[in-house]
């Protein structure tokens, strides 16, 4: 049988006085007589730390040899044995129990140096804002590691504001009431002490704690001036008006400081735009829409102002939407001259006789902007590329000087274009231009006529080609009617129209022979109207060697 | 009193550019407009073209459009002409003239000589 | 463009004479200008509106005419008219300029 006792170590003092701490022994060596040798394993003698044990292997005796450290190794578990003299155990081997009992050895140590914390402002009382934390490595749940918490200095100093709870860390806010436009942050240092907090001259460790206080909606927009002017100058657009400045107490860039505007009246019209300056927490407002002088010299609106952010319910009952209202004048701007329209019609025609040059065929008036009358302005030609007309310099007043031509090189679709420029008398000058379209009515004036009156063909072509051209327009002109005068007699006989096309035929020989023919044509146009003389197709057929053109007839020439 | 004072004598080479500038004092300079016109070596007078100062829009005279451009600069009452891509037939002086009463050219620069030479 | 002529080309009066210088448009214009340009300086405006007398033009000079037909006229010559004068006009765009009659002192 084993002889022993459980055993009970303080840390941290000279426990050398109290060797042996323990003892084994085994009553067989009595009972039996044997010889024997005791041994001792575990931590302490066989496994780290090592030589914190030593032992009298005669006697069975333990000492200790250190100062031992219960935060190292609180607990050692070492095994004796009994051993005959071949080493064969002589008894089960026994577990022998060393508790190392804790001294208040150890200071509790923040587990951050500095805290960092936020709660909303105008926050409720005991509204938890964080929690705070340290570690005490002496043995848990007792004196030496109970950790209590203290608040050593907040900044500001006054009033107080938060308070910690001394036993869990949190930091609550106290009846206080926070407000962040008065203090953004507060810096508090916190201690933490064991043994029940109780103030020794041991060294305790000490944290930074900073709270951020978060900003709420709690001040009202207000603006800087009550009364705003703008100026504008009619006709223009997106132009600055005027700038609304605002201040705001709430933290600056946020959504509570950020002015936020409508239009309280006076923008039924859509004239205006406010949008806010996010830097400036200005509104910028913008004409958007252009404004007439003539027709509007005031323009006056008002906006409200409030918050991008919705209010704080601490001041909702005391926001009051107040108009602020804006007085803007339109300037007048000179417009100078304007024509109502910038292109004229003008009807004339080609039938206008000799007594018709110098006949006015209408006026190009200019018109002041502003009063609408007409303008006091000199009238100048800027492009009259055939000089068909002339420009009274006071009036306005167009005259023809030379008679209209259908038929003009310079008449498009039946129009000759003339531009006018108005130059303005009053200052400051100013130069507008204006086209007239002078639309010349046709008249029958012109007759079909050959387009090639001379031609050649080989004796061996079954058809000549047959044009005619008609200078007039629609509808004096195309389409025509071709017929072969029968001059000399039999002559129509042997020229044939095999097909008519609207302004040429198809000419066909019935007897093939060489020589030059006259063929006479009566080709009327589309109201039937002809040339009094007579249209002569010249038409020479000749024989034709390997498509190399005309040999010189063999034959007499003949007419008909 | 009514004074325009034109920028001073250019020699440049053929193909280059040139801006001769006009610059008006004594009246209100946007209320009136700015002629140019070219006096050859033979004393013949064309005129190149107008700009409306206040109303910033011009008339060229065909001839010169893309070799003259007129512009202006209100805030220190200057005109400018431009001439482009020059050979040896502009080589003129070249005058701005203010466009009056009466639509006149009342009143005239001391003229900008221009040489184009390589 | 409407053409101006002037004629003469050149001429030369003594002091005192009546002198006369004519310009002819190749179109009908509404009014005529009249400058002066002395050599060594920049054009100066004699007449404008075919008759009317610019600002500090002695009233020996005057203008007439209408249609295509412009004329210009000295009453009583002096030294210092000697110079060349150009009409212009501007009915139409471009303006334009005759090529001017050089009047000399004799």
């Known amino acids: 049988a084993w002889i022993t006792a459980p055993v009970a170590l303080r840390e941290g003092e000279d426990l050398s006085k109290k060797n042996p701490i323990a003892k084994i022994h085994s009553d067989l060596a009595e009972e039996r007589g044997l010889k024997i040798t005791y041994k001792y394993t575990g931590k302490g003698i066989t496994e780290p730390p090592f030589g914190i044990f030593v032992f009298n292997k005669d006697t069975g005796e333990l000492n200790v040899t250190s100062i031992l450290d219960r935060e190292e190794t609180p607990f050692f578990l070492l095994t004796g044995y009994a051993l005959d003299a071949r080493g064969n155990n002589v008894e089960k081997p026994l577990e022998l129990r060393i508790k190392v009992l804790d001294i208040n050895d150890n200071e509790p140590v923040f587990t951050q140096d500095v805290f960092v914390g936020s709660v909303e402002e105008l926050s409720a009382a005991h509204t938890l804002v964080m929690k705070i934390n340290a570690t005490d490595a002496d043995e848990p749940n007792t004196l030496n590691s109970k950790i209590s918490y203290r608040i050593v200095s907040l900044e500001p100093a006054y009033p107080p504001v938060f308070y910690l709870n001394k036993d869990t860390g949190e930091i609550y806010t106290t009846s206080v009431t926070l407000d962040r436009e008065e203090h953004s942050s507060y810096t508090l240092t916190v201690e933490a002490r064991d043994g029940n907090g109780e103030v020794t001259d041991k060294p305790v460790k000490q944290a930074q704690v900073q709270i951020r206080i978060l900003d709420v909606n709690d001040n009202i927009p207000v603006v800087e001036n009550k009364v705003l002017e703008g100026m504008v100058e009619e006709n223009q657009v997106n132009v600055e008006v005027t700038r609304i400045k605002v201040f705001d107490a709430d933290e600056i860039g946020s959504d509570n400081w950020l002015a936020n505007f409508t239009f309280a009246s006076g923008n039924e019209g859509g004239y205006f735009h406010i949008e806010t300056d996010a830097q400036t927490n200005e509104g910028i407002v913008t004409l958007i829409k252009e404004v007439d002088y003539e027709e509007m010299k005031n323009l006056d609106f008002s906006v409200i102002v409030a918050n991008k952010a919705a209010f704080h319910k601490s001041i909702r009952s005391k926001y009051k939407p107040t108009p602020i209202p804006i007085k803007v004048k339109v300037k007048n701007v000179k417009e100078g001259i304007h024509f109502k329209s910038s292109v004229i019609s003008i009807y004339v025609s080609e039938s206008m006789d000799r007594s018709s040059k110098g006949q006015i065929i209408g006026n190009f008036q200019a018109f002041d902007e502003d009063t609408g009358l007409p303008a006091h302005a000199r009238y100048v030609k800027l492009e009259d590329r055939d000089n068909w007309i002339s420009v009274d310099s006071v009036t306005s007043e167009i005259k023809l000087a030379k008679l209209p031509d259908f038929e003009s090189r310079y008449v498009q679709n039946g129009t000759y274009t003339v531009k006018i420029v108005a130059i303005s008398e009053d200052y400051p000058r100013k130069t507008i231009t204006g086209t007239v379209l002078i639309n010349v009515e046709d008249i029958n004036d012109n007759c079909p006529t050959l387009i090639e009156p001379v031609q050649t063909i080989c004796h061996d072509a079954e058809y000549v080609n047959v044009t005619a051209e008609d200078l007039d327009g629609h509808p004096n002109s195309g389409p025509f009617s071709f017929s072969v005068i029968d001059k000399p007699p039999g002559m129509a006989e042997k020229w044939k129209i095999a097909r008519q096309e609207s302004t040429s035929v198809l000419l066909q020989q019935s007897e093939k022979k060489l020589g030059r023919s006259e063929i006479q044509f009566l080709i009327s146009d589309n109201q039937g109207f002809s040339c009094p003389e007579k249209q002569v197709l010249t038409l020479t057929v000749c024989e034709c060697l390997h498509g190399s053109g005309c040999r010189e007839a063999q034959h007499d020439s003949y007419v008909g | 009193q009514v004074k325009l004072q034109e920028s001073g004598p250019e020699l440049v080479r053929p193909g280059e550019s040139v801006k001769i500038s006009c610059k008006g004092s004594g009246y209100t300079f946007t209320d009136y407009a700015m002629h140019w016109v070219k006096q050859s070596p033979a004393k013949t007078l064309e005129w190149l073209g107008v700009?409306?100062?206040?109303?910033?829009?011009?008339n060229y005279n065909q001839k010169f459009k893309g070799k003259a451009t007129l512009t202006v600069d209100k805030s220190s009452s200057t005109a400018y002409m431009e001439l482009a891509r020059l050979t040896s037939e502009d080589s003129a002086i070249y005058y701005c003239?203010?466009?009056?009463?009466?639509?006149?050219?009342?009143?005239w620069g001391q003229g900008t000589s221009v040489t184009v030479s390589s | 463009d409407i053409v101006m002529t002037q004629s003469p080309a050149i001429m030369s009066a003594s002091p005192g004479e009546k002198v006369t210088m004519t310009c002819s448009a190749s179109s009908s214009v509404s009014y005529m200008y009249w400058y002066q340009q002395k050599p060594g300086s920049s054009p100066r405006l004699l007449i404008y509106d075919t008759s009317n007398l610019a600002s500090g033009v002695p009233v020996r000079f005057s203008g007439s005419g209408s249609g295509t037909s412009y004329s210009l006229t000295i009453s009583r010559m002096e030294a210092e008219d000697a110079a060349t004068y150009y009409c212009q006009q501007w009915s139409s765009f471009p303006l334009t300029f005759g090529a001017g009659t050089k009047l000399e002192l004799k």
């Open positions: 700009i409306s100062i206040y109303y910033d829009n011009t």
């Open positions: 003239a203010r466009e009056g009463d009466y639509f006149a050219l009342d009143y």
